[in-house]
């Protein structure tokens, strides 16, 4: 179950540690936010810090060099190593859920494809800890709403298994 005990905000792997390209983004979010959108990258998963750093770089490279975005689209990425990787962070508008939802939400993406399996318990704990930390830091409203990517756009993301999982988290709300 999702926890909201902010006693310890687990450290987030900063951009310089996973050797991110410099961000070119400028659009700020208006905190605290009411919405969190959970997606999956639909690509390779990773289960060690080294492989997850590489995967974060891969996603960022695709978003910036192929799609021409100002940065990796997600505010945060979650690895199956149990770590949270900083994307655009709490302060900058993401490119994860379309232009209506992006300015009012934080986008967190699990690195991997979760159509047929759930993320590791470590990854799930990392995501839940991130959300609790967001509330504790004032980046998310205490009564924030959690959405699946497919709730806000026509997509299979975050995958059937991860989608079913987050629907049981207390902040999940439909429509």
């Amino acid at each position: 179950q999702e926890t909201e005990d902010p006693a310890c905000c687990s450290p987030i792997v900063p951009r310089n540690e996973w050797k991110a390209l410099a961000s070119e983004c400028a659009q700020h979010l208006s905190l605290p936010l009411r919405y969190v959108v959970v997606s999956h990258t639909a690509g390779s998963s990773c289960n060690t810090p080294a492989s997850c750093q590489q995967q974060a770089r891969n996603v960022q490279h695709y978003h910036m060099k192929t799609l021409g975005w100002c940065d990796v689209g997600y505010n945060f990425l979650i690895g199956e190593d149990g770590l949270v990787y900083e994307g655009r962070g709490w302060n900058f508008t993401g490119a994860h859920s379309g232009h209506l939802w992006n300015p009012m939400s934080i986008g967190i993406s699990f690195m991997g494809n979760y159509m047929d399996r759930v993320p590791t318990p470590q990854a799930i704990r990392a995501a839940q800890g991130l959300l609790a930390c967001g509330v504790a830091q004032g980046a998310l409203r205490s009564n924030y709403v959690l959405k699946g990517h497919r709730d806000v756009q026509r997509t299979l993301s975050p995958g059937n298994q991860l989608y079913h999982l987050i629907q049981n988290w207390p902040h999940y709300r439909s429509p």
Epitope: S30, G98, L100, Q153, R154, S174
Partner: antibody, heavy 120, light 106 residues
């Protein structure tokens, strides 16, 4: 029962301005976006914009920028829409609408509407 | 901006008859929303996320569609269903409404 009570009908002269109010009751006002929609006589609906009462953030339809200004008074659970430089084209029924909490783009409760008539 | 074309503009149906109205969109949208408005009253939420019914909306109503074509269907017309129905998209700014389908009872 959730209610959005709008101010009464207005008859104003061209060039004047008007402020329409929308008082919310029986829900937590700051938890829900408030939207405004225009319905001209015998016509369809046009989205004007919305305001997040929590922090006052607004978003406008480009067509209504400079025409409409959205504000809130949290102490009285009231949203306001100020319309300026009125012309006959602004004559319409204006609705305030609450956006659902889980999906802010789903308009779940509508006010009764405020009829604005602009005439000399 | 995205344009929504509703057809027919006016439709007459007898009690018990099946009614279908459509909403054609100028470019693809993710979801469609429908509102019911009776004369002299405010619109009411009717169908959301293309096919979901809020509480209070009779099960004889259904919504379907994807991309640029959406529809609202009443399986068996009743007198209380006489109203104007508007479709609306939120995929692109600004959100836009269709011009409405006026459903009359025969």
């Amino acid at each position: 029962e959730i209610q959005l009570q709008q101010s009464g009908p207005e008859l104003v002269k061209p060039g004047a301005s008007v402020k329409v109010s929308c008082m919310a009751s029986v829900y937590s006002f700051t938890d829900y976006n408030m939207y405004w929609v225009k319905q001209s006589r015998g016509k369809s609906l046009e989205w004007i914009g919305y305001i997040d009462p929590y922090n006052g953030d607004t978003s406008y339809n480009q067509k209504f920028k400079g025409k409409a200004t959205l504000t809130v008074d949290k102490s009285s659970n009231t949203a306001f829409m100020h319309l300026n430089s009125l012309t006959s084209e602004d004559s319409a029924v204006y609705y305030c609408i609450r956006g659902d909490y889980g999906n802010p783009f789903y308009l779940d409760y509508w006010g009764q509407g405020t009829t604005l008539t602009v005439s000399s | 901006q995205i344009v929504l074309i509703q057809s027919p503009a006016i439709v007459s149906a007898s009690p018990g008859e099946k009614v279908t109205m459509t909403c054609s969109v100028s470019s693809s949208v993710n979801y469609m929303y429908w509102y019911q408005q009776k004369s002299g009253t405010s619109p009411k939420r009717w169908i959301y996320d293309t096919s979901k019914l809020p509480s209070g909306v009779p099960a004889r109503f259904s919504g379907s569609g994807s991309g640029t074509s959406y529809s609202l269907t009443i399986s068996s017309m009743e007198a209380e269903d006489a109203a104007t129905y508007y479709c609306q998209q939120w995929t692109s700014n600004p959100p836009t409404f269709g011009s409405g389908t006026n459903l009359e009872i025969k």
